[in-house]
């Protein structure tokens, strides 16, 4: 039998400091370009190789981004949030959402060796 | 997994038009920055255009006689090359990236910016 496939929200704030080239990613979403269904929030894309963000290494591909320097990301088009990164500074704080997938299968024994994190 | 499909290459007089096009797979593609870039024979491959949700932008050389467009319902973007020059004369290669940067534009000039590249089609303009 298969397992439920759930879903672990977590948030975090990560302070970025703005490399040679930038912070180093892509983001997707916005009023104007829905990315996930009936949600218009700005989500991460791509994280760039040796880019700030990469090198940070605690935002991941898929994280939504709720605020940047303490300003709100909600209902904004997506040029306006694009902007307000570029316009964030040498030191960007971002609101993060984690979204980690958590697979619930059956409940077994759990033998000997088996991790017990 | 993006597939890019680049179509509209040939032969043309110097002055005359031509116009590329580039088709894409995938159900998001009006998320996805796309680009176009040109390499002739025995140079490195160069920037020609790119077009993100809402910006355009363009390499010196082609400013003014190239226009990028994309049209989102057929999951296209195009390159209209006007008054067109020997010079301009290279295999041009369609290239996509998801997302928009959020860093200044102009990272979009260089081809580790993009993840997804076609196979190019020929260009060659005639004296």
């Known amino acids: 039998m298969n397992g439920r496939v759930d879903y672990l929200v977590t948030e975090e704030e990560i302070n970025l400091t703005r490399g040679p080239s930038g912070l180093g990613f892509n983001i997707v979403g916005g009023t104007d370009q829905q990315y996930v269904s009936n949600d218009s929030g700005i989500y991460v894309s791509r994280i760039k190789e040796n880019g700030a963000a990469a090198l940070d290494g605690r935002l991941q591909e898929g994280d939504k981004i709720l605020s940047v320097n303490g300003q709100d990301l909600k209902n904004l088009l997506h040029q306006d949030a694009v902007d307000l990164f570029r316009n964030a500074g040498y030191a960007v704080s971002l609101r993060v959402q984690h979204r980690l997938q958590v697979q619930n299968g059956p409940i077994g024994h759990r033998g000997e060796g088996d991790p017990s994190g | 997994q993006v597939q890019l499909v680049e179509s509209g290459g040939g032969l043309v007089q110097a002055g005359g038009s031509l116009r590329l096009s580039c088709a894409a797979s995938?159900?998001?593609?009006?998320?996805?920055?796309m680009g176009w870039f040109r390499q002739a024979p025995g140079k490195e491959r160069e920037f020609v255009a790119a077009?993100?949700?809402?910006?355009?932008l363009y390499s010196d050389s082609v400013k003014g006689r190239f226009t990028i467009s994309r049209d989102n319902a057929k999951n296209t973007v195009y390159l209209q090359m006007n008054s067109l020059k020997p010079e301009d004369t290279a295999v041009y290669y369609c290239?996509?990236?998801?997302?928009?940067?959020?860093?200044?534009?102009?990272?979009?000039?260089?081809?580790?910016?993009?993840?997804?590249w076609g196979q190019g089609t020929q260009v060659t303009v005639s004296s």
């Open positions: 995938g159900r998001t593609f009006s998320t996805y920055t």
């Open positions: 290239a996509a990236v998801q997302g928009s940067p959020v860093d200044t534009i102009v990272v979009l000039t260089t081809s580790e910016e993009y993840d997804y």
């Open positions: 077009v993100t949700w809402s910006e355009t």
